[in-house]
């Protein structure tokens, strides 16, 4: 007879969940030779038992301690790109601007982008049913407190100027209740921190808007300098342009604005 | 009750300098962007300058580029338009404005305005 | 001259509805907000209509505002003789990177 499972409202564990882990940790030491030290089967072990047999609503972030420990890593702390409902393009633009870094181009990140995981309490078992989703379960599910605990130490990092890109197609260019808006924000060292730059990215039909005026990003800058960091903003009209210019910064036509 | 509050108008030559001062109260200065807009005697409305909350965005109008200069001091709740190599067509009534909440280019918040003349 | 085209005047009796136009291009009216403020003469500015066609608390009303493609308008219905200002549009100009009013339009209240 099967036992009985609890039914959560999110999608449940991506298949072949530990082997993906594992995996994708092989393959991002055998690529960046810094983490080459980097034990991976250590580094599933201490993913698994931050969540296996815990209820997945009762997550916390020193579940996922030892998991930060075997994954510290170094970035270029001057080079940090946080983005915030505009992923796809901020990872094509750091393949191509390898000298800069998204969360997911660190060891951690890459582990974990696009999966979902969560076990249940009291057994050794992974639900591949469903997981709790973050508003109609709990927030303090497996996933929700992995990407707020790695985001946080990514923001805490960073030094200089920080660069982020946001999605000018949104309703809400800047969402206080993003990953970005809720974590990063509030993780940037004032002591470190000298600028953000926020780069807004235009989408669909070319358009003349300045969204560097959008409210939202009024009221992002207000608690930006409120942290004693200064900011800036950027619109990137054109994507396609943008991304190409990176590739090809001496085309002639990558000087007028993008 | 927000108010603003122009001063440092006068009358200058041309080529000489003056800083208008624009005094805010009412309201918290520090969340607000904030603008520069004049008006020649008998004539309309022209935008001069805007400036963000933690001064990282500026714009100015072609007309006052590269001679003019807006400022703020937050912990003054002032705004400042810096103004140099002044000529006769910069003459006119100097107004500081406010941006409206949740809003892109509106300005609820009008100062009475300060006169600056530039003749010789 | 201006990058937002207004007629220079406009007049109506009390009780009637005017309407003032403002015709601008891509760069501004179209890809941006509209504005609409109210001068009376020796006063400030007033800001009247926001984002094409919102009314800011204590504005009245009579007082609309509406967009299509690169033209704008605001409508005064049930004239006033305190109607009597210079009205003036102003949006954001993508091309010259910066805030544009129109050239004003003088209402009389006949």
């Known amino acids: 007879v099967p036992r009985w499972r609890q039914q959560w409202s999110g999608p449940g564990t991506t298949k072949r969940f530990p082997e993906t882990v594992l995996a994708r940790c092989v393959k991002y030491t055998e690529i960046h030779p810094e983490m080459r030290h980097v034990d991976c089967q250590s580094v599933w072990d201490a993913f698994k038992g931050a969540f296996i047999s815990k209820h997945p609503c009762n997550i916390t972030e020193e579940d996922y301690q030892p998991l930060m420990k075997l994954g510290t890593q170094t970035v270029p702390c001057n080079k940090i790109l946080l983005w915030s409902r505009i992923k796809d393009l901020a990872h094509q633009f750091t393949q191509v601007q390898r000298d800069m870094f998204t969360l997911e181009d660190t060891l951690l990140g890459y582990l974990a982008d696009d999966l979902t995981w969560c076990g249940e309490f009291n057994t050794s078992k992974i639900n591949y049913q469903s997981c709790p989703d973050w508003r109609k379960d709990c927030s303090n599910n497996p996933v929700s407190v992995f990407w707020k605990t790695v985001s946080r130490r990514f923001a805490e990092a960073a030094c200089d100027v920080v660069h982020v890109m946001l999605n000018g197609s949104r309703s809400k260019i800047f969402d206080k209740n993003s990953t970005f808006g809720s974590v990063e924000v509030h993780n940037l060292q004032p002591e470190k921190v000298q600028t953000l730059e926020a780069w807004v990215i235009h989408g669909g039909r070319e358009d003349s808007r300045d969204l560097c005026q959008d409210p939202t990003i009024k009221e992002l800058e207000s608690i930006i300098s409120k942290r004693n960091i200064q900011f800036s903003c950027k619109n990137i009209y054109r994507p396609d342009k943008f991304l190409q210019c990176v590739k090809n910064p001496e085309d002639s036509s990558c000087t007028s604005e993008i | 009750e927000v108010q603003l509050l122009e001063s440092g108008g006068g009358l200058v030559q041309p080529g000489g300098s003056l800083r208008l001062s624009c005094a805010a109260s009412?309201?918290?200065?520090?969340?607000?962007?904030m603008n520069w807009v004049r008006q020649a005697p008998g004539k309309g409305l022209e935008w001069v300058s805007t400036?963000?909350?933690?001064?990282?965005?500026?714009y100015y109008a072609d007309s006052v580029k590269g001679r003019f200069t807006i400022s703020r001091d937050n912990s003054k709740n002032t705004l400042y338009l810096q103004m140099n190599s002044l000529r006769a067509e910069d003459t006119a009534v100097y107004y500081c404005?406010?941006?409206?909440?949740?809003?892109?280019?509106?300005?609820?918040?009008w100062g009475q305005g300060t006169t600056v003349t530039v003749s010789s | 001259q201006s990058v937002l085209t207004q007629p220079p005047s406009a007049s109506g009796t009390p009780g009637q509805r005017v309407t003032i136009s403002c015709s601008g291009s891509?760069?501004?009216?179209?890809?941006?907000?509209v504005y609409w403020y109210q001068q009376v003469p020796g006063t400030a500015p007033k800001l009247l209509i926001y984002k094409d066609d919102q009314r800011p608390s204590g504005v009245p009303d009579r007082f609309s505002g509406s967009k299509s493609g690169t033209s704008a308008s605001l409508a005064i219905s049930g004239l006033q003789s305190d109607d009597e200002a210079d009205y003036y549009c102003a949006t954001w100009d993508g091309s010259l990177n910066g805030r544009v009013f129109g050239g004003g339009t003088k209402l009389t209240v006949l």
């Open positions: 400036i963000s909350i933690s001064g990282g965005i500026i």
């Open positions: 009412g309201f918290t200065f520090s969340d607000y962007w």
């Open positions: 404005a406010k941006d409206n909440w949740n809003d892109y280019y509106g300005m609820d918040v």
């Open positions: 891509t760069s501004n009216i179209r890809d941006n907000y």
